[in-house]
């Protein structure tokens, strides 16, 4: 028997779009934009499980849905890769893999996933619930990292299947069928808006949810575009080192910590929705980290799909050696 | 561009202990191990250990453990490799390297003899 | 410990013409689930420090020339040199990548015939 901690981060969607919108038609251009906008938004997902021949031993598993190629991973416990994280293995896809204890295994599952198991005896193993932390570097979406651990083991409800297969035939599905989809959803906003340059916009109403919906952002991913991409997974986290995660950023800047609800992932639905807010904190969470390579010069404009952002202190660091940016 | 930067030669007793430095320049002195490879004259190379800086984790060479000790210091970013007990089989070039052996320190001669 | 067996211990070959040296490891190499052969190799001249030349069994690294070239899988690798300079006589090493400790060939001495 396993204990995991998985759950799907979608949701139904929300109520009251329709009416934000004015009219059922406007809604479809606005998915299409977000759809071909956020096409390429790669996510990060983690499983953490103990196993329960050995209470002691954790299985830690990591996988990158995106398109791009994996030029290195780094797995952290007690916080993110670089804020406060302890690095227990580094896997690069061909020069090999570092691991250092507890790490007992670390390998390549398959070509964009990897585990990694821990001993746990003595003063350097986990405790149940302690954060590990998976980053991605990747070209060219750049470095994505997500943190997760282990649920409290009394909570009956956080039971996920066996093999977070769905993981990985939702990324295959993504990279095949999106393709298409897109095309054709991109040609057919552009005839929906050519369409509508010759006639008056409708006036919208103003959104109840959001203030601020003037300042919607485009890049904004929206619940379909996640729901027609891929399903990623976020994993429930209840650390026993808050102060790890009250730390993991301390140079402010774009870093939201959007604490998500347990049986789901909040994500901006519609324009009214998409103004940055807070969720309120409910002792779980999810991250992705969206850090340039160094040659870039600079952060991108927006911080992946809409989930906690760990920016690096170091700034966007790049990897040595010639598959990373020097 | 990632460089490494070793001491000098050393001439040392047998009994006595060795430490070697490696000064890194270039890339996140923290990111990746340093590794340390020694080669007996005309003999092959040989791992020893490695360590981690940004937590000092380390990894030996079995046969090592016990008489070699990897240290790091970020501050200065430099990594140490200190070799106890030296014997006169012990003379080799020292080197440390990084990034899975992708760059590598010029190597320090060390010489164990009475 | 993987054990890493080069052969030949020393070769000889003309300029231009191909040279070939096999690696052999006690263990596969192979991980199995992104189907990469963990496998590095090595050139070490005269009093420098040795120089990676390709990882993966196959990916050269940055800046070494494309006369080299990496194959093989599992337990079986070979490093060729498809056409030899002058500046190529040097001593080859493979080294497994693949598991705790790292291990390395007893080197193959390349001189020109």
């Known amino acids: 028997m396993r204990t995991e901690a998985q759950v799907p981060a979608l949701q139904p969607p929300e109520p009251g779009l329709e009416g934000a919108m004015g009219h059922r038609t406007l809604v479809l251009p606005w998915v299409l934009l977000t759809l071909c906008v956020t096409a390429g938004t790669p996510e990060v997902w983690v499983q953490v499980r103990m196993e329960a021949t050995e209470l002691s031993s954790f299985t830690i598993r990591c996988g990158f849905l995106g398109s791009g190629s994996i030029s290195l991973v780094t797995v952290s416990w007690g916080g993110p890769n670089g804020a406060g994280g302890t690095t227990l293995a580094v896997l690069h896809p061909e020069r090999g893999i570092r691991q250092w204890a507890p790490a007992r295994q670390a390998r390549w599952e398959t070509q964009s996933s990897i585990s990694l198991i821990l001993e746990g005896s003595g003063a350097s193993s986990p405790c149940a619930n302690t954060t590990f932390c998976c980053k991605f570097a990747s070209f060219p979406e750049g470095s994505w990292e997500a943190c997760g651990s282990l649920p409290p083991s009394s909570d009956p409800g956080l039971s996920a299947p066996p093999t977070p297969a769905p993981i990985l035939r939702a990324d295959l599905a993504g990279i095949l069928g999106v393709s298409g989809v897109l095309l054709f959803g991109c040609v057919y906003l552009l005839h929906l808006l050519r369409r509508h340059k010759h006639r008056p916009a409708p006036r919208l109403q103003p959104s109840r949810t959001s203030p601020q919906a003037p300042r919607a952002r485009a890049w904004a991913p929206s619940q379909a575009s996640q729901a027609a991409l891929h399903v990623p997974y976020a994993t429930i986290n209840t650390s026993c080192r808050p102060a790890t995660l009250d730390t993991a950023h301390p140079h402010g800047g774009p870093s939201w910590w959007a604490s998500l609800p347990t049986h789901a992932a909040h994500r901006p639905q519609g324009p009214a929705a998409w103004a940055s807010t807070p969720i309120p904190a409910r002792g779980s969470f999810v991250s992705v980290e969206n850090g340039l390579y160094a040659q870039a010069g600079e952060r991108p404009p927006h911080t992946g799909p809409g989930l906690t952002l760990f920016p690096d202190p170091r700034g966007p660091r790049a990897m040595e050696g010639p598959l990373g940016v020097r | 561009e990632v460089q490494l930067v070793q001491s000098g030669a050393e001439v040392k007793k047998p009994g006595s202990s060795v430490k070697v430095s490696c000064k890194a320049s270039?890339?996140?002195?923290?990111?990746?191990?340093i590794e340390w490879v020694r080669q007996a004259p005309g003999q092959g190379l040989e791992w020893m250990g490695e360590i981690l800086p940004g937590s000092n984790s380390t990894n030996y060479n079995e046969k090592f453990k016990g008489r070699v000790t990897i240290t790091a210091d970020e501050s200065t970013s430099t990594a140490y490799m200190e070799l106890s007990s030296l014997r006169s089989e012990d003379t080799a070039v020292y080197y440390c390297?990084?990034?899975?052996?992708?760059?590598w320190g010029q190597g320090t001669l060390v010489t164990v003899s009475s | 410990d993987i054990v890493m067996t080069q052969s030949p211990d020393s070769l000889a070959v003309s300029l231009g013409e191909r040279a070939t040296i096999n690696c052999k490891s006690s263990?596969?190499?192979?991980?199995?689930?992104?189907?990469?052969?963990?496998l590095a190799w090595y050139q070490q001249k005269p009093g420098q420090p040795p120089k990676l030349l390709i990882y993966?069994?196959?990916t050269r690294e940055s800046g070494v020339p494309d006369r080299f070239s990496g194959s093989g899988s599992g337990t079986d690798f070979t490093l060729t040199i498809s056409s030899l300079q002058a500046e190529d006589v040097a001593v080859y090493y493979c080294q497994n990548a693949h598991s705790y400790p790292p291990t390395f060939g007893q080197g193959t001495k390349l001189e020109i015939k």
């Open positions: 993966g069994a196959s």
């Open positions: 270039g890339g996140t002195f923290s990111s990746f191990s």
């Open positions: 390297a990084r990034y899975w052996f992708a760059y």
């Open positions: 263990q596969s190499l192979l991980n199995s689930g992104n189907q990469k052969n963990y």
